[in-house]
């Protein structure tokens, strides 16, 4: 145990000219890497907006919160944070906005206390299926991660590999069943068109799921049944047209759930009747009085809660011989 007195070393900002002096020696307890700012009392290291191209090797052993935001890391290799001795205390790692386009298998290995990881605002064209699990075993050692923040990680269209982006992300989430303890998952702003049907069933500990600002059209094949701990489900700003009976029943069956559905292009025709009835009765939808129709044109901006069955009709589909030109 230590009994530190206040000293200048507890908060230091290393000068740029020391950048080449990175040592392979084990770091001193109060050493602060070049281009970083350290506070031992807050157990925090901030290497922010410094155009770093790799993770500093000489991170202090006390680091519990590591901010590596606004850099130019490009690739996160296997064992990017592996140190001898290991960074046993590191609990929160923020790599947002650091121009990462590749995260390799085992990038976060040897971080036994890592609870919160933020990779947001990186154009992840290549996210290894084993980025979070560390191995390609069918069942990996459980990851300590509790919060995984992956907002706006979709790469530009021309940088995407010839595979489904949704599939790539989901493969990383499900590999080796390593993320069984995950409680918060944020996947906002990723242009997701669909949610693979098996993803939620394998994340049974989820309490908070954010899928806002995507392009989800339907939840028909998505099951929420296993997510008995789910407390918040953010589906704002998607392309949802209607929620069908199966989805409504599953959401209603979750004991602690709050659902956010604002700014979706709801289609107010005969298929909407069940959802309107449910909305009028349910307490789980936050701000349900703000939900409005987008289509058909005659229903635009009508409030869903104010509709009745007579408002919700489907134009008859005429047989071809009776259709006019």
């Amino acid at each position: 145990s230590s009994s530190p007195t206040s000293s200048a070393s507890s908060f230091s900002s290393s000068a740029p000219f020391l950048a080449s002096a990175v040592s392979a020696q084990p770091p001193l307890p109060d050493q602060c890497p070049a281009l970083c700012e350290c506070s031992e009392a807050a157990r925090t290291v901030k290497c922010v907006n410094r155009n770093l191209t790799e993770v500093p090797t000489d991170l202090p052993a006390y680091v519990r919160n590591l901010f590596l935001t606004g850099n130019q890391l490009a690739v996160l290799p296997a064992g990017a944070f592996a140190r001898r001795p290991p960074l046993a205390e590191l609990a929160a790692l923020n790599l947002s906005g650091s121009r990462l386009d590749e995260v390799r298998a085992g990038a976060f290995e040897h971080l036994p206390s890592l609870r919160q990881l933020d990779l947001s605002h990186n154009p992840l064209a290549d996210l290894s299926p084993f980025a979070f699990s560390g191995s390609n075993a069918s069942v990996s050692a459980p990851s300590p991660l509790v919060e995984l923040i992956l907002n706006h990680i979709v790469p530009p269209e021309d940088e995407r590999q010839n595979r489904s982006f949704e599939g790539m992300v989901v493969a990383a989430l499900l590999a080796g069943r390593a993320l069984q303890g995950l409680r918060r998952l944020e996947l906002a702003s990723n242009h997701f068109l669909y949610l693979p049907r098996d993803v939620l069933a394998q994340l049974p500990s989820l309490r908070h799921l954010d899928l806002s600002n995507n392009s989800l059209v339907s939840l028909t094949y998505v099951s929420f049944r296993n997510l008995t701990h789910l407390e918040s489900l953010h589906l704002e700003d998607n392309a949802l047209k209607v929620l069908h009976n199966g989805t409504l029943a599953e959401l209603q069956g979750l004991p602690h759930i709050r659902v956010f559905l604002d700014n979706n292009p709801w289609v107010c025709d005969c298929h909407m009747a069940d959802m309107v009835t449910w909305l009028k009765e349910t307490e789980v939808v936050q701000g349900k009085d703000r939900l409005t129709c987008a289509y058909p044109e005659k229903m635009r901006n009508r409030v869903l809660l104010e509709l009745n069955s007579a408002d919700l009709d489907c134009d008859p589909i005429l047989p071809p011989s009776l259709q006019t030109s």
């Epitope: 507890s10 908060f11 506070s39 009392a41 807050a42 919160n65 206390s113 609870r115």
Partner: antibody, heavy 122, light 107 residues
Framework: GVQLQQSGPELVKPGASVKISCKAS????????MNWVKQSHGKSLEWIGD????????TYNQKFKDKATLTVDKSSSTAYMELRSLTSEDSAVYYC???????????????WGAGTTVTVSS | DIVMTQSPATLSVTPGDRVSLSCRAS??????LHWYQQKSHESPRLLIK???QSISGIPSRFSGSGSGSDFTLSINSVEPEDVGVYYC?????????FGAGTKLELK
Amino acid sequence: GVQLQQSGPELVKPGASVKISCKASGYTFTDFYMNWVKQSHGKSLEWIGDINPNNGVTTYNQKFKDKATLTVDKSSSTAYMELRSLTSEDSAVYYCATGAIHYGYDGYFDVWGAGTTVTVSS
Amino acid sequence: DIVMTQSPATLSVTPGDRVSLSCRASQSISDYLHWYQQKSHESPRLLIKYASQSISGIPSRFSGSGSGSDFTLSINSVEPEDVGVYYCQNGHSFPLTFGAGTKLELK
């Protein structure tokens, strides 16, 4: 919810020792440092030190390093502080406190126990 | 040790007033400054972390500003229940230290 339940008031004689407890619930005990803070009557707050429940590593305020000993029992999610060689100056309310609502972040306290009053008197 | 100096020691206010409490650190602590409210016979309660970050469940009338060594806690429209002692805390360097407090009372 997240709670820290402290042991009851103590009346002790000068020169004696006392061990007070703080039982955590509603979060993973080993995820967050446990801090101890002293508040003498009508006075401000003084940080005594903290302990990492995961490995028992402690950090003390120099002022209290010969006065307080911090320990934990992981099996019962309980933190302890022993105060020794007590004098009237040690009469105060002692709080345990942690940052248990927020992963990772340290150096501030968003969950506090109700406090344990220690009175040193002959 | 970093010394935290709060002013004024006491502030007498009328409900609806906008008030500012000052805290000065004896050396720069970046934004590692936290504010607490303590009502009579209660434990302290975190109001603001990292100089200006709001805390869930704390009324929006409480806000913080500052960086380096000068910090301010503002209450934009004081309510009667805001009476108590307000402490600032250095969360930057060991040992963690608190100011002596500003007592907020009603006129």
